[in-house]
Interface confidence: low
C-alpha cells in the first residue's frame, strides 16, 4: 500500500493526462483526485502508464468504490482490467454488452483467465441467461467458449440464442454436448425450410437420434462425410443402406475411405453383405 | 462422472492442525469452486469457507484466523488447513463443489459432496 | 450471520403421505441480481448431504418431481408430495446470498 505523503505544491493534476507518466507513484497517490479519475477513465488506456502506476490508480479508485465499481467506471477501465482480480470482479454490477465487449477486448488473444470468467458470470447472472446477443459476444471473442460449458450449464442455454452459434462455435464440444445442444438447434430452426434448415442444423448432428437422421435421409440433403463421421455411433447403426445412400447422396463414395472408422466401421458391420453390395463401392462386412 | 474424494488423518492432537486434500475428477477446478464444510452433531452443518475457480477465498470469520484453503488447478487438488484445533473442532469435515462455473451464479449451491473426513480431537 | 430456523424438527409420516418442510431465515434472501440463493438437502443415515433444490425451486438433476421448493423473502417451504421409503432422512435448508453461507438445524423425516 503506498504511504500518504502530501502534493508537492503545483503538481496535483487538473486532469488525467499526459503529464501523469511522469509522476512517481506516491505522487500520483497524493496528486490525482480519485473523483476526477473515476470521470476521466477513457483518458487512462490512452496513456502508457507503467504497471505500478496502474496499480496506485486501482488503489484510489478501491478506496473510493469499496463495495465495487459502478459501471460507469468499468466501461472505461481498459487495461486497468487485467489489474483485477476475480474478488474485486465479483462486486460488480455488469449489465450493458458494450461494457462486457470493451473488457473482453482488452484480453483479446489471450486464453481466457480468471479474471474473464468471473466477468462472463456476473454479466450473464445479471442477465438471468445466455441470451442471443451475449452468446454471440462472447463466441466472438472465445470461439471455443460454448464447448467450455458443461452439459449441465448448456441446458440453461435458451433455444433462442442458437441463432448466435457458428459452426466453428461447435468443433471442440463432445458428444454429451452436442446431446444437449441439438435439441434447442432443432427448436430454433424448425420453421425453416429443407435446405435451409439443413445447413444451419449440419453443425449440431453429433446430438441427433436416429428418428431425425432417417427424416433427413428423405430430404436429399446430401450430408457430406465429415458431418457423418461426428454422427453418434447409436444413431448411425439401425440406419439402413438404402436411407445411408439417401443421406449421403453423392457423397456415398467416401464410405470405402471411411471404412476402418467408427461410425461407419460399426455401420457396415450391422449390414448384410448383399446390401452393401448394392453400394458397389466394395464395403466387406 | 462428478466426484469429490478427500483424504485426511481421523485423530489429531489439541492445538495441532488439520490438513485435509480433496482430490476431485468429472471436472475442472479452473471452471468450479469448491466448499468446505463440517457437521457435528452439536452444531449441526457449519460453512467453513469457499476457494473460487480464480483462486480467491471466502471464509466464515469465526474462522479466519486458523483456516486456509488452496489448490492446484493441474493436479485437480483443493488444500484446508486448520490450525489450533480443539475438542469441539471434532466433526465430519466435507469438501463440495459450488454447482455454478461460467454461465451460472457463484453464489449457488454446493451440488456434489465429497464422502466426508471424520475428524476427532483428542489427546 | 443469517440464522436460518427450520420447523418442524422431526416430521412422521406415513408413506404415500404429503409432507411440508418450512425454513425462515432472520433477514432477506434476494441478492442483490434479483435471484433468491435458497437450498434444499437431504442427508441419509451415514451418507454426505445430497443438493435436492437449488434457489428456491429448481429440481437439481435426476431429482424426482414429487419434490418441489416454494417461497421468497425470508419463509420457504419443501413438499413433498407422496413420501416414500428413499425420502426418509434429514432435510436441511441453506442460504448462499450472504456470507457466510448457514445452514437450518434440519428436519428428520421418519416413519409414523
Known amino acids: 500500500e503506498v504511504e500518504k505523503t502530501a502534493c508537492p505544491s503545483g503538481k496535483k493534476a487538473p486532469e488525467i493526462d499526459e503529464s501523469l507518466i511522469f509522476y512517481k507513484k506516491w505522487e500520483l497517490e497524493a496528486c490525482v483526485d480519485a473523483a476526477l479519475l473515476a470521470t476521466q477513465m477513457d483518458r487512462v488506456n490512452a496513456i502508457p502508464f507503467t504497471y505500478e502506476q496502474l496499480d496506485v490508480l486501482k488503489h484510489k479508485l478501491d478506496e473510493l468504490y469499496p463495495q465495487g465499481y459502478p459501471e460507469s467506471v468499468i466501461q472505461h477501465l481498459g487495461y486497468l482490467f487485467l489489474k483485477m482480480s476475480p474478488e474485486d470482479i465479483r462486486k460488480w454490477n455488469v449489465t450493458s454488452l458494450e461494457t462486457l465487449k470493451a473488457l473482453l477486448e482488452v484480453n483479446k488473444g489471450h486464453e481466457m483467465s480468471p479474471q474473464v470468467a468471473t466477468l462472463i458470470d456476473r454479466f450473464v447472472k445479471g442477465r438471468g441467461q445466455l441470451d442471443k446477443d451475449t452468446l454471440d459476444t462472447l463466441t466472438a471473442f472465445y470461439p471455443g467458449y460454448l464447448c467450455s460449458l458443461s452439459p449441465e450449464e448448456l441446458s440453461s442455454v435458451p433455444p433462442s440464442s442458437i441463432w448466435a452459434v457458428r459452426p466453428q462455435d461447435l468443433d471442440t464440444c463432445d458428444p454429451r454436448q452436442l446431446d444437449v445442444l441439438y435439441p434447442k438447434a432443432r427448436l430454433a430452426f424448425q420453421n425453416m425450410n429443407g435446405s435451409e434448415y439443413f445447413v444451419k442444423i449440419q453443425s449440431f448432428l453429433g446430438g441427433a437420434p436416429t428418428e431425425d437422421l432417417k427424416a433427413l435421409s428423405q430430404q436429399n440433403v446430401s450430408m457430406d462425410l465429415a458431418t457423418f463421421m461426428k454422427l453418434r455411433t447409436d444413431a448411425v447403426l439401425p440406419l439402413t443402406v438404402a436411407e445411408v445412400q439417401k443421406l449421403l447422396g453423392p457423397h456415398v463414395e467416401g464410405l470405402k475411405a471411411e471404412e476402418r472408422h467408427r461410425p461407419v466401421r460399426d455401420w457396415i458391420l450391422r449390414q448384410r453383405q448383399d446390401d452393401l453390395d448394392t453400394l458397389g463401392l466394395g464395403l466387406q462386412g | 462422472q462428478v466426484q469429490l474424494k478427500q483424504s485426511g488423518p481421523g485423530l489429531v492432537q489439541p492445538s495441532q492442525s488439520l490438513s485435509i486434500t480433496c482430490t476431485v475428477s468429472?471436472?475442472?477446478?479452473?471452471?468450479?469452486?469448491v466448499h468446505w464444510v463440517r457437521q457435528s452433531p452439536g452444531k449441526g452443518l457449519e460453512w467453513l469457507g469457499v476457494?473460487?475457480?480464480?483462486?480467491?477465498?471466502d471464509y466464515n470469520a469465526a474462522f479466519i484466523s486458523r483456516l486456509s484453503i488452496s489448490k492446484d488447478n493441474s493436479k485437480s487438488q483443493v488444500f484446508f488447513k486448520m490450525n489450533s484445533l480443539q475438542a469441539d473442532d471434532t466433526a465430519m469435515y466435507y469438501c463440495?463443489?459450488?454447482?455454478?462455473?461460467?454461465?451460472?451464479?457463484?453464489?449457488?449451491?454446493?451440488?456434489?459432496w465429497g464422502q466426508g473426513t471424520s475428524v476427532t480431537v483428542s489427546s | 450471520d443469517v440464522v436460518m430456523t427450520q420447523t418442524p424438527l422431526s416430521l412422521p409420516v406415513s408413506l404415500g403421505d404429503q409432507a411440508s418442510i418450512s425454513c425462515r431465515s432472520s433477514?432477506?434472501?434476494?441478492?442483490?441480481?434479483?435471484?433468491?440463493?435458497l437450498h434444499w438437502y437431504l442427508q441419509k443415515p451415514g451418507q454426505s448431504p445430497k443438493l435436492l433444490i437449488y434457489k428456491v425451486s429448481n429440481r437439481f438433476s435426476g431429482v424426482p418431481d414429487r419434490f418441489s421448493g416454494s417461497g421468497s423473502g425470508t419463509d420457504f417451504t419443501l413438499k413433498i408430495s407422496r413420501v416414500e421409503a428413499e425420502d426418509l432422512g434429514v432435510y436441511f435448508c441453506?442460504?448462499?446470498?450472504?456470507?457466510?453461507?448457514?445452514f437450518g438445524g434440519g428436519t428428520k423425516l421418519e416413519i409414523k
Open positions: 433477514q432477506s434472501l434476494v441478492h442483490s441480481y434479483g435471484n433468491t440463493y
Open positions: 468429472g471436472f475442472s477446478l479452473f471452471s468450479y469452486g
Open positions: 441453506s442460504q448462499s446470498t450472504h456470507i457466510p453461507f448457514t
Open positions: 463440495a463443489r459450488n454447482g455454478g462455473s461460467m454461465i451460472t451464479t457463484l453464489y449457488y449451491a454446493m451440488d456434489y
Open positions: 476457494i473460487w475457480s480464480g483462486g480467491s477465498t
